[in-house]
């Protein structure tokens, strides 16, 4: 998260750091009691790693007592999801059993209205991704309100010249932004899910290529299929 | 498949105004910027404007700000482009063109013409 | 307002030729966030512009491979390897990095 600040402790129970091999690799969101949401692209390179699910965290290192780290049963990436697009880049975590629920984890209830957040909503963003363009990874939960960006504009040949379809949305990225690491992650309008950090190479920070998150009200078909 | 129609051209005389149509269709229209691009006889393509079709916010040529003016109407996904006080240089093919990727789709053109 | 200056203003070739056309802008076209916005069109006659070349180098999907850009800061490039009979056209350049976007006067390619 850039431009971002420490997020209150446990005050998102529903944020999950996707974990390979033991390392942070992206983020996720609780969105039932055995499975978790994030972006398939964070898992194109983990063929041969341990996926793991960390729910209940502030700190990535220090010990606390809602932390707890899951394996994952089943990895459930969108099927239309291509290394090379950033269409459809959605990924359902199925833990090896049910979270253990508590003050600092919970389920975040998501979107199903397939209906555009008006532009200027302001959202909120978490992660555990870096913090400056130097690469800094953070040990504790980073957080950011950021206003969403209506289509159009985030259409245009300046910013992401029609890339961004009725599947995505954008939120505004001047200095404060999503960033690597933080792919997977939940945007949050409202007390509601309403997006999911795409991954990729996207610069961070820079006003004109705004942040890009898939809108999980489009997918509801499938993570009710999914989750069934 | 994106399509672009524009209608509204003719003959108008001079001091003249009209109303030009785009009207959209194979996309959702409040995705995408829409240009207006016109091109006189035997001449080059030159650059009238933009409107984002959710916040109807407009960008003008210089040029053509005080006399042409773009609206909207997103229940058709049609864009307006009003030319008043007409003069024979206005003459020209006009076109409006998506913004997305770059100006990939284009209307067949209207033909203006401004003559007494 | 950003001038774009093409040459030649037009051309004689025969099929098979190599084309290049030039065009130069008043000043960089190197937007704030690092691209450059320099894109190609072809013309037809009582035809709308079509897209050939965004982003100084890049192909627009479908636009064959004997189609090339290049060229950097002020001065660029329009490429055709190996000219084809639906080629002959009149070619347009066009800076979208700074408002007014600009289109450059046109090459017109004839066939000799």
């Known amino acids: 998260i850039l431009g971002g600040r420490e997020a209150e402790a446990h005050a998102r129970p529903y944020m999950a750091s996707v974990q390979l091999n033991g390392a942070h690799l992206c983020g996720g969101v609780l969105v039932a009691e055995q499975w978790v949401l994030s972006a398939a692209h964070c898992l194109e390179d983990a063929a041969d790693g341990k996926v793991q699910v960390l729910l209940g965290a502030h700190s990535l290192s220090q010990p606390e007592p809602s932390k707890r780290l899951y394996d994952v049963l089943r990895a459930v990436p969108h099927p239309d999801s291509q290394p090379d697009t950033i269409d459809h880049d959605l990924l359902l975590l199925q833990l090896s059993e049910k979270a253990t629920l508590g003050p600092a984890v919970r389920p975040l209830p998501w979107q199903r209205v397939d209906r555009d957040v008006a532009p200027g909503t302001l959202c909120d963003v978490a992660g555990w991704g870096i913090v400056n363009h130097a690469g800094r990874r953070p040990d504790s939960l980073q957080h950011v309100l950021l206003p969403v960006l209506d289509r159009a504009t985030c259409n245009r040949r300046t910013h992401h010249d029609g890339a961004i379809t009725e599947r995505l949305m954008c939120a505004e990225s001047n200095r404060r932004d999503s960033c690597k690491g933080d792919s997977g992650g939940p945007l949050v309008c409202g007390g509601v899910l309403e997006g999911v950090v795409t991954s990729g190479s996207r610069v961070c920070g820079n006003r004109k290529k705004p942040g890009i998150y898939t809108r999980v009200a489009s997918y509801a078909a499938w993570i009710d299929s999914v989750l069934a | 498949e994106v399509q672009l129609v524009e209608s509204g051209g003719g003959l108008v005389q001079p001091g003249g105004s009209l109303r030009l149509s785009c009207a959209a269709s194979?996309?959702?229209?409040?995705?995408?910027?829409m240009n207006w691009v016109r091109q006189a006889p035997g001449k080059g393509l030159e650059w009238i404007g933009d409107i984002n079709p959710v916040t109807g916010d407009t960008d003008y040529n210089a040029d053509f700000k005080r006399r042409f003016t773009f609206s909207l109407d997103t229940s058709k996904s049609t864009a307006y482009l009003q030319m008043n006080s007409l003069r024979a240089e206005d003459t020209a093919v006009y076109y409006c063109t998506r913004e997305g990727p770059s100006f990939a789709y284009w209307g067949q053109g209207t033909l203006v013409t401004v003559s007494s | 307002d950003i001038q774009l200056t093409q040459s030649p203003s037009s051309l004689s070739a025969s099929v098979g030729d190599r084309v290049t056309i030039t065009c130069r802008s008043s000043?960089?076209?190197?937007?704030?966030?690092?691209?450059?916005?320099l894109e190609w069109y072809q013309q037809k006659p009582g035809k709308a512009p079509n897209l050939l070349i965004y982003k100084v180098s890049n192909r627009f999907s479908g636009v064959p491979s004997r189609f090339s850009g290049s060229g950097s800061g002020t001065d660029f490039t329009l490429t055709i390897s190996s000219l084809q009979p639906e080629d002959f056209a009149t070619y347009y350049c066009f800076q979208g990095s700074h408002v007014p976007v600009t289109f450059g006067q046109g090459t017109k390619v004839e066939i000799k």
């Open positions: 194979g996309y959702s229209f409040t995705s995408y910027y």
């Open positions: 000043q960089t076209i190197v937007h704030s966030n690092g691209d450059t916005y």
